[in-house]
């Protein structure tokens, strides 16, 4: 029987800068029942606080509700593991809510094949920002990424859409059924999960000649460049 091993706070995430949750990994339990508590203070404070909510985020978590979440404040937190033989503490973690935002996926993904008579056919993709994000305040800039692939293909095509909430894609395989998904990230923060897939059947007559493929981006009203994983590196927050 031993004191508990050192716990580790491994992740903090906020869906919208208004609330956030942190999770820790317990160390070894030393063969005894172990209690965990998270304490924190804010930068510029020495007043120590205890986690206000150990329930909402699930096991080994601390949830900070609206009234506990301050923008522009760095939280300095640690986890204490205690059993009958003694205690151990995690390293301190510094958390700025601005940099831990991971939004919910975008909503209302709609995909449509457009075949105007006078113009080239294209796939039109439209979505809405996640509901928890209030873009009107100006606190947020959300960036979007689309991925799509034929149903049976292994590789995804990834398109970076910037701040737009709609996008047009030209080069598709006629007659194929495509899966389309979209995700978002704030300017500082983490990519959301991908939205649920939307399926779209591309008609067999969805064709264009080479001349039609060379269309300006302005003409399309959306960015068309197919971005490689390397190109995308600077859009991702690792």
């Amino acid at each position: 029987q031993l004191p508990p091993g050192k716990p580790e706070i491994f992740k903090c995430r906020s869906p919208n800068k208004e609330t956030f949750t942190c999770w820790w990994r317990p160390g070894t339990d030393g063969g005894l029942p172990t209690n965990y508590s998270l304490t924190y203070h804010r930068e510029g404070e020495t007043l120590m606080h205890e986690c206000p909510d150990y329930i909402t985020g699930g096991p080994n978590s601390c949830h900070f509700g609206k009234q506990y979440t301050s923008m522009w404040r760095t939280y300095i937190m640690m986890v204490n593991a205690t059993n009958q033989m003694g205690s151990s503490f995690s390293d301190e973690l510094y958390v700025d809510v601005t940099y831990i935002v991971q939004p919910d996926p975008p909503l209302e993904l709609a995909v449509e094949v457009k075949q105007p008579e006078d113009r080239k056919p294209y796939l039109w993709i439209k979505w809405s920002p996640p509901t928890l994000i209030d873009l009107k305040t100006g606190w947020f800039t959300l960036l979007y990424e689309i991925r799509l692939k034929p149903e049976k293909a292994a590789e995804w095509e990834i398109h970076f859409a910037g701040q737009q909430t709609e996008f047009k894609i030209l080069s598709l395989h006629p007659g194929q059924k495509y899966l389309v998904q979209v995700r978002c990230k704030p300017d500082h923060g983490y990519w959301s999960a991908w939205s649920p897939a939307t399926f779209i059947q591309i008609p067999s007559d969805f064709t264009m000649n080479d001349e039609q493929k060379l269309i300006s981006e302005e003409d399309l009203g959306g960015e068309q460049k197919l971005i490689s994983e390397e190109d995308l590196h600077h859009h991702h927050h690792h």
């Epitope: 508590s37 304490t39 510029g44 404070e45 007043l47 606080h49 205890e50 909510d53 009234q67």
Partner: antibody, heavy 118, light 107 residues
Framework: EVQLVESGGGLVQPGGSLRLSCAAS????????MNWVRQAPGKGLEWISY????????YYADSIKGRFTIYRDNARNSLYLQMNSLRAEDTAIYYC???????????WGQGTMVTVSS | DIQMTQSPSSLSASVGDRVTITCRAS??????LAWYQQKPGKVPKLLIY???TLQSGVPSRFSGGGSGTDFTLTISSLQPEDVATYYC?????????FGGGTKVEIK
């Protein structure tokens, strides 16, 4: 309705003891840090004690250290102040106050009067 | 311990006047400062926190300013219902010290 109601005040002789209670309702008491603040007749506000949500962190003002004990019972939604070795200068209205998430006293009780006199 | 000094200790002004109360911390406290209003015979009420953030429901004639060691509470146009004692309080560390208070009266 969010409410704090103090009780337990009264007249006590110097050197005596008293236990103040604060009953909370209308909010999740166990998620909030709580405090006692007092106000002597005609004087200003004096913070005297703080307790964290699960009771693991406690602070006292120097004026009461070693004589008063703050504790809480989250199952009963109650905060307590055990006051021993009371002095005349402890005569005051005692308020319990909820500390909001940004560390300010957002909810106050109506107060309970403690008079220490022989 | 950090001391909080308020001035003036009392003031008398006319309805509609602009009133400013100052609070000085003996050491820097960033903007961890709150202002409370206590009307005669009543419980204290939070007005402002983080030095300048107005608590919801508080009239916009109240405003706060300052950072570090020097802070102000301003009532832009004094109303009869503003007769009260005003307290500043620091909350960055224990003890959570209050200032001595400023009593505001109507001339």
């Amino acid at each position: 309705e969010v409410q704090l109601v103090e009780s337990g005040g009264g007249l006590v002789q110097p050197g005596g003891s008293l236990r103040l209670s604060c009953a909370a309702s209308g909010f999740t008491f166990s998620s909030y840090e709580m405090n006692w603040v007092r106000q002597a007749p005609g004087k200003g506000l004096e913070w005297i004690s703080y307790i964290s949500s699960r009771g693991g962190t406690i602070y006292y003002a120097d004026s009461i250290k070693g004589r008063f004990t703050i504790y809480r019972d989250n199952a009963r939604n109650s905060l307590y102040l055990q006051m021993n070795s009371l002095r005349a200068e402890d005569t005051a209205i005692y308020y319990c106050a909820r500390l909001s998430g940004v560390d300010i006293f957002d909810i106050w009780g109506q107060g309970t009067m403690v008079t220490v006199s022989s | 311990d950090i001391q909080m000094t308020q001035s003036p200790s009392s003031l008398s002004a006319s309805v509609g006047d602009r009133v400013t109360i100052t609070c000085r911390a003996s050491q820097g406290i960033s903007n961890y400062l709150a202002w409370y209003q206590q009307k005669p015979g009543k419980v204290p009420k939070l007005l402002i926190y983080f030095a300048s953030t107005l608590q919801s429901g508080v009239p916009s004639r109240f405003s706060g300013g300052g950072s570090g060691t020097d802070f102000t509470l301003t009532i832009s146009s004094l109303q009869p219902e503003d007769v009260a004692t005003y307290y500043c309080q620091r909350y960055n560390s224990a003890p959570l010290t209050f200032g001595g208070g400023t009593k505001v009266e109507i001339k």
